[in-house]
């Protein structure tokens, strides 16, 4: 079947990185500066991608792949492709249309973007507060008040939370 | 308040230079992720991109154009300039400034422009 | 470069109705695709970027859709203030703008 289509179409022969030249009896040239053709049998070659601007280049062009851009220093991407770069705020902080902005009391933003998100409840299961939140970090819920031995003087803190992928010491 | 004013249009002699300029408020044009183009409006005509520079002094050109533009700043007066060579009459048309992206977030596009300025070239 | 065709050229419509603009690129360009309204003696207004995201302040009834070479401006009830001309903008490969449409009153 390969070489059935190819003795139909001299275009199928062309490999990625060039095109079908159809100014030159259908021979394989390769794909000017700033274009690319990532596929074999293609008649035109596409003009890259070029970051530009808050973009900038994570992959270079190539003759058989586009360009890839992220977000200059400062900002993140988003959207597909990395459409668009969104402001970077401070922990503690979101953004708005003004700016970024301080989270409420009662709220926190442990990253760079996103929402300031609500503290955890920790009555809702029936847990109390060990550690209050502040506008960086959420609370740490602790024993529920009724799992403490009566007449204890002092709760033992939990053990530091390892990482992800960490054994203990 | 992003403001971007536009000055330096008016008439000038076919073959002759202009230098335009745009006084930037709002915004600091050296901020990062910030990046200001130069794009134009021949009369009764599409829009047409001229040039882009960005916080960090990289330039972009339209091809066609490349050989007569030059793109420039001056950070301290914060104030975008586009010298342009050769005139000729099909030059003529309202030149805009215009700021890349919004306040927060940024891409390939133009949210604040200036309200331009016209130059005619004819003799 | 990458070239953007706009149809129609022009059109007239009446208040009320449904306004559908095309924009067609000679090749992929992701979401990278805004559109601006102008009207005549003012600089452009940016209605819509990232292909579909409405920029601040604009009206619900403009709407935009589309990915790779096919994009799509729709008004969705136009209104007295909405008669003006119309521009695609593509900001994948350096920049360019569509030949434009008007809107005129029918």
């Known amino acids: 079947f390969e070489r059935t289509r190819s003795l139909q179409d001299p275009c199928s022969n062309c490999p990625a990185g060039t095109f079908c030249d159809n100014n030159r009896n259908q021979i394989c040239s390769p794909c000017p500066p700033n274009s690319f053709s990532s596929a074999g049998g293609q008649r035109t070659c596409d003009i890259c991608r070029q970051c530009k601007g808050v973009f900038r280049t994570r992959k270079e062009c190539s003759s058989t792949s586009n360009a890839e851009c992220d977000c200059t220093p400062g900002f993140h991407c988003l959207g597909a492709g990395c459409s668009m770069c969104e402001q970077d705020c401070k922990q503690g902080q979101e953004l708005t249309k003004k700016g970024c902005k301080d989270c409420c009391f009662g709220t926190f933003n442990d990253q760079k973007r996103g929402i300031c998100r609500p503290w955890t409840n920790c009555s809702l299961d029936g847990k109390s507060v060990l550690v209050n939140g502040t506008k960086e970090r959420d609370v740490v819920c602790g024993p529920s008040p009724a799992d403490l031995s009566p007449g204890a003087s002092s709760v033992t803190p939990p053990a530091p939370a390892r990482e992800p992928g960490h054994s203990p010491q | 308040e992003v403001q971007l004013v536009e000055s330096g249009g008016g008439l000038v002699q076919p073959g002759g230079s202009l230098r335009l300029s745009c006084a930037a408020s709002g915004f600091s044009l050296s901020t990062s992720g910030v990046a200001v183009a130069w794009i134009r409006q021949a009369p009764g005509k599409g829009l047409e991109w001229l040039a882009l520079?960005?916080?960090?002094?990289?330039?972009r050109y339209s091809t066609s154009l490349k050989s007569r533009l030059t793109i420039s700043r001056d950070n301290s007066k914060n104030t975008l300039y586009l010298q342009l060579n050769s005139l000729r009459a099909e030059d003529t048309a309202v030149y805009y400034c215009?700021?890349?992206?919004?306040?927060?977030?940024?891409?390939?596009?133009?949210?604040?422009w200036g309200q331009g300025t016209l130059v005619t070239v004819s003799s | 470069d990458i070239q953007l065709t706009q149809s129609p050229s022009s059109l007239s419509a009446s208040v009320g109705d449904r306004v559908t603009i095309t924009c067609r690129a000679s090749?992929?360009?992701?979401?990278?695709l805004a559109w601006y309204q102008q009207k005549p003696g003012k600089a452009p207004k940016l209605l819509i970027y990232d292909a579909s995201n409405r920029a601040t302040g604009i009206p619900s009834r403009f709407s935009g859709s589309g990915s790779g070479t096919d994009f799509t401006l729709t008004i969705s009830s136009l209104q007295p203030e909405d008669f003006a001309t119309y521009y695609c903008?593509?900001?994948?490969?350096?920049?360019?703008f569509g030949q434009g449409t008007k809107v005129e009153i029918k």
């Open positions: 090749q992929g360009i992701g979401t990278y």
């Open positions: 903008q593509q900001g994948y490969s350096l920049w360019t």
């Open positions: 215009a700021r890349e992206g919004s306040t927060t977030v940024v891409g390939d596009w133009f949210d604040y």
């Open positions: 520079i960005d916080w960090d002094d990289d330039k």
